[in-house]
Interface confidence: medium
């Protein structure tokens, strides 16, 4: 709305950079072929670029990431009863950003 | 995968908090009856609750809120020329969080 | 105070019955798995019972699968272990103790124990 | 049924570093607890999910597990660390507990 303009602050700008975001670890990345299973713990911290950029042409994107092995439970349901086991996800921490210039495929003449 | 055990440390729930995540400022939260103009910035910083609970039957929820009025250039197109204008945009900032009982419905017998 | 207090225990012969009650206070009990461990005089800890955080999940250490039952009733806060058909072998101190988590995991708070004695 | 072994007992000087073992088949594909049992009391947990600690539980605990071999150690051992020590792993269906290492301050 345009009112109440005097109680408002300026907006500030969400600038392209890392920020910690939560991760939910779906049973797939653990196993495709078996779904009688939970995953412990369901979500963890990632650190991912977000935020925008100075102008409409650009993006904001991860410019260095890292992959994370991280150890979780599979618990396998057995007749009723559970099975615990590890596994490991990996997850993608982004590490630096930078504000990239989208390029669009021309259409071919 | 089961396998690369040793690296990997413990994966950490993450947990039911406020964190800041990036809100895009869309145009129709300005006015709805015109699609002919810019909003700067295009998105904002605000606090959000997020993460996951200990229990299966709770959810990570808002317990606490605030409105934040912020202002937002509108950059309306009028004859291939901008013309700057002021409007406002109310944010909602989580303040605090809880884990709530999911209530499912029970089916009217 | 974060605490479990268990208390039914006692000298009962070869043959009998006893109830175990563990009462919980100072946390959503209802959001935590639960499990008995006992000790023999003089032994080392042994897993006897697990009940998950709904009461749904239930299981059995060997010895005991046939003659004990494992049950909860979260709107008193009160996990039970009801003893049928006892032996001399089952004399221990008896702990209920927390999951931290709906599905088990490590016993992150114990009671102080109570003593059930099988004895002619 | 799976079974976890500890050896009986350590011992280890005030300052030095306790190690105590806790052995089973495939034991690394499971996440070990160690618990702290003091005379006439009940047990701590003093390690979980293989290295992690508890707060309120010292830094000079510390745990490890890989292989067929879980190993609680204690750096810069103290008096007040005399006590039974017992491992514990949920594996098929039950939760298992090792037959305890007594531990012994010289």
């Known amino acids: 709305s345009l009112g109440s303009l005097a109680a408002a602050e300026p907006a500030v700008i969400a600038e392209c950079k890392t920020r910690t975001e939560v991760f939910q670890i779906s049973r797939n990345l653990i196993d495709r072929t078996n779904a009688n299973f939970l995953v412990w713990p369901p979500c963890v911290e990632v650190q991912r670029c977000s935020g925008c950029c100075n102008n409409r042409n650009v993006q904001c994107r991860a410019s260095q990431v890292q992959m994370r092995p991280v150890q979780v439970r599979k618990i396998e349901i057995v007749r009723k009863k559970p099975i615990f086991k590890k596994a490991t996800v990996t997850l993608e921490d982004h590490l630096a950003c930078k504000c990239e210039t989208i390029v669009t495929p021309r259409p071919v003449t | 995968s089961l396998g690369s055990l040793a690296a990997a440390e413990p994966a950490v729930i993450a947990e039911c908090k406020t964190r800041t995540e990036v809100f895009q400022i869309s145009r129709n939260l300005i006015d709805r009856t015109n699609a002919n103009f810019l909003v700067w910035p295009p998105c904002v910083e605000v606090q959000r609750c997020s993460g996951c609970c200990n229990n299966r039957n709770v959810q990570c929820r808002a317990s606490q809120v605030q409105m934040r009025p912020v202002q937002v250039r509108k950059i309306e197109i009028v004859r291939k020329k901008p013309i700057f204008k002021k409007a406002t945009v109310t944010l909602e900032d989580h303040l605090a969080c809880k884990c709530e009982t999911i209530v499912t419905p029970r089916p009217v017998t | 105070e974060v605490q479990l207090v268990e208390s039914g225990g006692g000298l009962v012969q070869p043959g009998g019955s006893l109830r175990l009650s563990c009462a919980a206070s100072?946390?959503?009990?209802?959001?935590?798995?639960m499990s008995w461990v006992r000790q023999a005089p003089g032994k080392g800890l042994e897993w006897v019972s697990y009940i998950s955080d709904d009461g749904s999940l239930k299981y059995y250490a060997d010895s005991v699968k046939g003659r004990f039952t494992i049950s909860r009733d979260n709107s008193k806060n009160t996990l039970y272990l009801q003893m049928n058909s006892l032996r001399a072998e089952d004399t221990a101190v008896y702990y209920c103790a927390r999951h931290p988590y709906w599905y088990g995991g490590q016993l992150d708070l114990w009671g102080q124990g109570t003593l059930v004695t099988v004895s002619s | 049924s799976y079974e976890l072994t500890q050896p009986p007992s350590v011992s280890v000087a005030p300052g030095q570093t306790a190690r105590i073992s806790c052995s089973g088949d495939s034991l690394g594909s499971y996440f070990v607890h160690w618990y702290q049992q003091k005379p006439g009391q009940a047990p701590v947990l003093v390690i979980y999910?293989?290295?992690n600690r508890p707060s309120g539980i010292p830094e000079r605990f510390s745990g490890s597990n890989s292989g067929n071999t879980a190993t609680l150690t204690i750096s810069g051992t103290q008096a007040e660390d005399e006590a039974d020590y017992y491992c514990s792993a949920f594996t098929h269906n039950s939760d298992v507990f090792g037959g305890g290492t007594k531990l012994t301050v010289l």
């Open positions: 999910d293989d290295s």
């Open positions: 100072g946390f959503t009990f209802s959001s935590y798995a």
